[in-house]
């Protein structure tokens, strides 16, 4: 036994565009309350009932009146926890539905009017005794933030609240075969007293006085093997006293699960995993139909016209889950090729392509130079999804349309003066230097560090750089 506890942190508009209108107004003040419904197992249904693990209703929140013109803020919440007691073991996996209800406090005839504002559903794994788990769920434009936990009620302990604890009889340690009840180290695990004579090897009990048999054993005390004939394909353990077990009729033979449920054998007997919309030991009970509106975010409910048939939600693009309750991060699949940037716009997926690529998914590699003329005799060079022009002497810029200033980089060394020329640049060297860029000193004795100047050029003459 134990208690499932739910703490609502906030309920208000979710992120993104399309903020919802405030549910309350000056003309129609209202207050919120919450309902939680729990069911065992990872059933894929979002039924309003039955809530096999239990259900709870919160207190009413403070009265809220919208401020005219203000966006809907996080709405005032009821105080305290929602608590759902469970009598048996905690199942470890559970389905939940949390509904946000509005109570209108206007002058309604016959008392306040209630309407469902939002409903979120999900399936979770949770060990009893663990810390609070935090969650955020969205329903349309609303966002609900909450925490939950399951805790055992003494004397039960453990992740399923199935172990029982008793105060220690001896001060120092627990009895033989019994463990301390962490975190209650001063208590000891209490043995369950099964039915007298229940086989310790082949029987067990979850409640005092019962005797349940492991697979392959039967009888009131679980001492009779299902079959002791030959030893073909044993189903269970063998022993010298009982011989080998052969497949007797297994608990799943003939599939006891109705409505398309799948059967799995358990130590006790069998367990049915039910399709969405069904529950019960043999999936014989239908919980939710299309009339309950189980599909969120524009999902279409298919089937489930009556309580005997399951429903399926066909989800619009961008949503998934048995109730279309989960938003798909479509960009996580990296649909944009060649380094394109993925944008999930909600109504569509867009790829913003890098230069040189095109197409809905940037799948087309453009010919970078196609239709790209480089001016003034420049030549186009492809590379990395972008074109580049290799410009003729005296021209520059992306398309070689700009006349280059050859002197901009100060190419003349040692204080030489630079002159732009139709075919490039000319350096007028300072006294004592020579060369196309005035890079070579002239020796004081008249000889230079270079071979003799070409005929017709004296050291110190402007050297034209061709």
């Amino acid at each position: 036994a134990g208690v499932f506890e739910l703490q609502i942190h906030s309920f208000g508009p979710g992120p993104g565009p399309g903020a919802p209108r405030s549910p309350c107004s000056a003309r129609l003040p209202c207050r919120l309350f919450f309902r939680v419904c729990l069911k065992p197992g990872l059933s894929e249904e979002a039924a309003e009932s039955p809530c096999a693990l239990g259900a709870a209703l919160s207190a009413r929140g403070p009265v809220y009146t919208e401020q005219p013109g203000a966006p809907a803020p996080d709405l005032p919440l009821p105080d305290g926890l929602l608590q759902v007691p469970f009598r048996d073991a905690w199942p470890g996996t559970f389905s939940f539905i949390i509904e946000t209800w509005r109570e209108e406090l206007g002058d309604q005839i016959g008392g306040p009017a209630w309407s469902l504002l939002a409903r979120v559903a999900g399936r979770r794994r949770l060990a009893a005794g663990g810390p609070w788990a935090r969650d955020i769920q969205r329903a349309g434009a609303w966002e609900l933030r909450f925490s939950y936990r399951a805790r055992c009620e003494p004397p039960a302990v453990g992740t399923a609240c199935t172990r029982l604890c008793r105060p220690r009889s001896a001060p120092s340690r627990c009895g033989p075969g019994l463990r301390p009840c962490a975190p209650l180290e001063d208590e000891c695990e209490a043995p369950l007293v099964c039915r007298a004579g229940c086989s310790p090897e082949h029987g067990f009990c979850e409640q005092p006085g019962e005797c349940r048999c492991l697979e392959g054993w039967t009888g009131p005390l679980c001492t009779v093997p299902v079959s002791t004939s030959s030893c073909l394909s044993p189903r269970g353990p063998s022993s010298a006293t009982t011989g080998c077990l052969v497949p007797g009729p297994g608990p799943c033979d003939g599939n006891p699960c109705a409505n398309g449920g799948s059967c799995s054998e358990t130590p006790r007997s069998f367990e049915c995993t039910c399709p969405r919309g069904f529950y019960g030991l043999r999936c014989e009970v239908s919980g939710v139909t299309c009339a309950d509106g189980p599909c969120f975010n524009g999902g279409l409910c298919v089937g489930g016209a009556d309580p005997d048939s399951a429903y399926i939600c066909h989800c619009p693009p961008g949503f998934q889950g048995s109730n279309c309750e989960k938003r798909v991060d479509r960009c996580s699949l990296q649909p944009c090729r060649n380094g394109g940037l993925c944008l999930d716009l909600g109504h569509a997926l867009r790829c913003r392509c890098r230069a040189g690529f095109a197409g809905p998914r940037c799948e087309h590699d453009l010919d970078d130079c196609a239709g790209r003329a480089c001016a003034n005799g420049g030549t186009c060079v492809e590379g990395g999804g972008a074109h580049r022009c290799s410009c003729a002497l005296g021209f520059g810029g992306r398309d070689c349309r700009e006349r280059a200033d050859p002197c901009a980089a100060r190419p003349c060394a040692h204080g030489g003066r630079c002159y732009a020329h139709f075919s490039g640049l000319v350096c007028a060297c300072a006294p004592g230097y020579m060369g196309a860029r005035c890079e070579f000193p002239v020796h004081p004795d008249g000889a230079s560090a270079l071979p003799a100047a070409p005929p017709g050029l004296r050291p110190g003459d402007p050297q034209r750089y061709l």
Epitope: A291, G293, P316, H347
Partner: antibody, heavy 118, light 108 residues
Framework: QVQLQESGPGLVKPSETLSLTCTVS????????WSWIRQPPGKGLEWIGY???????NYYPSLKSRVTISIDTSKNQFSLKLSSVTAADTAVYYC????????????WGQGTLVTVSS | EIVLTQSPGTLSLSPGERATLSCRAS???????LAWYQQKPGQAPRLLIY???SRATGIPDRFSGSGSGTDFTLTISRLEPEDFAVYYC?????????FGGGTKLEIK
């Protein structure tokens, strides 16, 4: 701007199969549901069925045994086949795109009249 | 299936007047999953309203939708000559998708 264009024979003989194709231009057929709707002369609109780009289908129950909707994403087309037609199947047939906000129709083809007659 | 009944079958009004078209569902339409379309002779229907009250892109604000549960209304606040057409409602809460029989809005 998404555009849809129906194509196929305008005259079909009773008991034969009506075949229509819808070509989608101005957008990808992927990531959407696509539907067929018909309108008998002088009457209202009747939903026939839809297909998702993944191939998932859903049909109007009374037509289910006779309808097949298929999709060819490489050609940006989806098709309708309606078998064993009778005069009651004479109608203007529309193809349409289902919106992302829910299962309503935001883009329609201009429609094509199919007459069932011998 | 959800049966949608539109009324009146024909509505005769003059330009400038207010038009109120009704769509009633045989079962409650969850989450207001209801759309309205306009169809002119020889043309395909055009989406006007979805979610019972949200206007589709490019639809003038003289068109408005309201209602919930089983009763929905399309209102045209001030009729323009181009508004005279047939109007259909459609539910998309559950399969099969169904349309109303239509309301013909004609010039008086």
């Amino acid at each position: 701007q998404v555009q849809l264009q129906e194509s196929g024979p305008g005259l079909v003989k009773p008991s034969e199969t009506l075949s229509l194709t819808c070509t989608v231009s101005g957008g990808s057929i992927s990531s959407y549901y696509w539907s067929w709707i018909r309108q008998p002369p002088g009457k209202g609109l009747e939903w026939i069925g839809y297909i998702y780009y993944s191939g998932r289908t859903n049909y109007y129950p009374s037509l289910k045994s006779r309808v097949t909707i298929s999709i060819d994403t490489s050609k940006n087309q989806f098709s309708l086949k309606l078998s064993s037609v009778t005069a009651a199947d004479t109608a203007v047939y529309y193809c349409a795109r289902i919106a992302v906000a829910g299962f309503f129709f935001d883009y329609w083809g201009q429609g094509t009249l199919v007459t069932v007659s011998s | 299936e959800i049966v949608l009944t539109q009324s009146p079958g024909t509505l005769s009004l003059s330009p400038g007047e207010r038009a109120t078209l009704s769509c009633r569902a045989s079962q409650s339409v969850n989450k207001n999953y209801l759309a309205w379309y306009q169809q002119k002779p020889g043309q395909a229907p055009r989406l006007l309203i979805y979610g019972a009250s949200s206007r589709a892109t490019g639809i003038p604000d003289r068109f408005s939708g309201s209602g919930s549960g089983t009763d929905f209304t399309l209102t045209i606040s001030r009729l323009e000559p181009e508004d005279f057409a047939v109007y259909y409602c459609q539910q998309y809460d559950r399969s099969p998708l169904t349309f109303g029989g239509g309301t013909k809005l004609e010039i008086k």
